[in-house]
């Protein structure tokens, strides 16, 4: 296993809808032709897998069916999408790249992205 | 870029089928290939996918336990293998290169009868 | 899964017609791509990541759309597009596909 860089957002706030948008960009040592991008939430020192990816020539990430992230590739960058925050899923939010084929295999995990995640406040009851 | 897949194929119910994909004219490495069923008169289904390189797979799960898809790097093939074959299984089998779909063999008739 | 339901199902045009095909998603998805098919041969892919068109399509083919809702319009029909053209999606697996538009002539 060799280690690879990563490097992603230091911050991100989410929209009012709940989604956040960042980038995940790699320093691939060769010509990777098959990627494998997993996105980890760390939050009270615990880690858990938010969603993944295995992805090939194409420019579409393609996730499992209740997955909450979209994303798309270009390049050494993958720009992920996550929806369906609350304020209860602010944490760090960190990118791990696999270059899975050909050999050898790399590994590379970034800092984290801080998500910020307001729920936006209920509208107040309209006399009109 | 060019892809060929074996010939026709008549089964019982409840036998098994392997149906290859021999690609060629580009890196077989490089990119998923899709397997993706067309019964007769009917849309097109995708049953899964396999990276050759690694052998990584996803499966459409109303295929799961019944279908296992393979690939062979060292003559550039792919296999997908159903089992517990029904009559609804009598479709026309395609295998197809990439994210992109982007070519297809003409495709394998599997024809599930008794 | 996502469901891709195509419209009109079924389509009778005259050449030289403009014709539009919809899409519409159950979920919002990234992209969407659009196959032709005609009888008795493979699909053929037309368009990917929702307007690039497919080496050798010709421009009187075009895709649009977002989210939940896409088109795949021919400006002028020719007596080879009649066909079979489905939708696909590729955001979440299982990759699907809507149940296709036939296209025929008038």
């Known amino acids: 296993c060799k280690a690879m860089h990563v490097a992603q957002p230091a911050v991100v706030l989410a929209s009012s809808r709940g989604i956040a948008s960042f980038v995940c960009e790699y320093a691939s040592p060769g010509k990777a032709t098959e990627v494998r991008v997993t996105v980890l939430r760390q939050a009270d020192s615990q880690v858990t897998e938010v969603c993944a990816a295995t992805y090939m020539m194409g420019n579409e990430l393609t996730f499992l069916d209740d997955s909450i992230c979209t994303g798309t590739s270009s390049g050494n960058q993958v720009n992920l999408t996550i929806q369906g925050l609350r304020a209860m899923d602010t944490g760090l939010y960190i990118c791990k790249v696999e270059l899975m084929y050909p050999p050898p295999y790399y590994l590379g995990i970034g800092n984290g992205t801080q998500i910020y995640v307001i729920d936006p406040e209920p509208c107040p009851d309209s006399d009109f | 870029v060019q892809l060929v897949q074996s010939g026709a194929e008549v089964v019982k119910p409840g036998a098994s089928v392997k149906v290859s994909c021999k690609a060629s004219?580009?890196?077989?490495?490089s990119y998923w290939i899709n397997w993706i069923r067309q019964a007769p008169g009917q849309g097109l289904e995708w049953?899964?996918?396999?990276?050759?390189?690694?052998?990584?797979?996803y499966y459409n799960e109303m295929f799961t336990g019944r279908v296992t898809l393979t690939r062979d790097t060292s003559t550039s093939t792919a296999y997908m293998e159903l089992s517990s074959l029904r009559s609804e299984d009598t479709a026309v089998y395609y295998c197809?290169?990439?994210?992109?779909?982007?070519?297809w063999d003409q495709g394998t008739m599997v024809t599930v009868s008794s | 899964d996502i469901q891709l339901t195509q419209s009109p199902s079924f389509l009778s045009a005259s050449v030289g017609d403009r014709v539009t095909i919809t899409c519409s998603a159950s979920?919002?998805?990234?992209?969407i791509h659009w196959f032709q098919q005609k009888p008795g041969k493979a699909p053929k892919l037309l368009i990917y990541?929702?307007?690039t068109l497919a080496s050798g399509v010709p421009s009187r083919f075009s895709g649009s759309g977002s989210g939940t809702e896409y088109t795949l319009t021919i400006s002028s029909l020719q007596p080879e597009d009649f066909a079979t053209y489905y939708c696909q999606q590729r955001t979440t697996y299982p990759l699907t596909f809507g149940q296709g538009t036939k296209l025929e002539i008038k």
């Open positions: 979920k919002s998805v990234s992209y």
């Open positions: 004219g580009y890196t077989f490495t």
């Open positions: 990541d929702t307007s």
């Open positions: 049953i899964g996918r396999i990276a050759p390189g690694s052998g990584t797979t």
């Open positions: 197809a290169r990439g994210d992109y779909f982007d070519y």
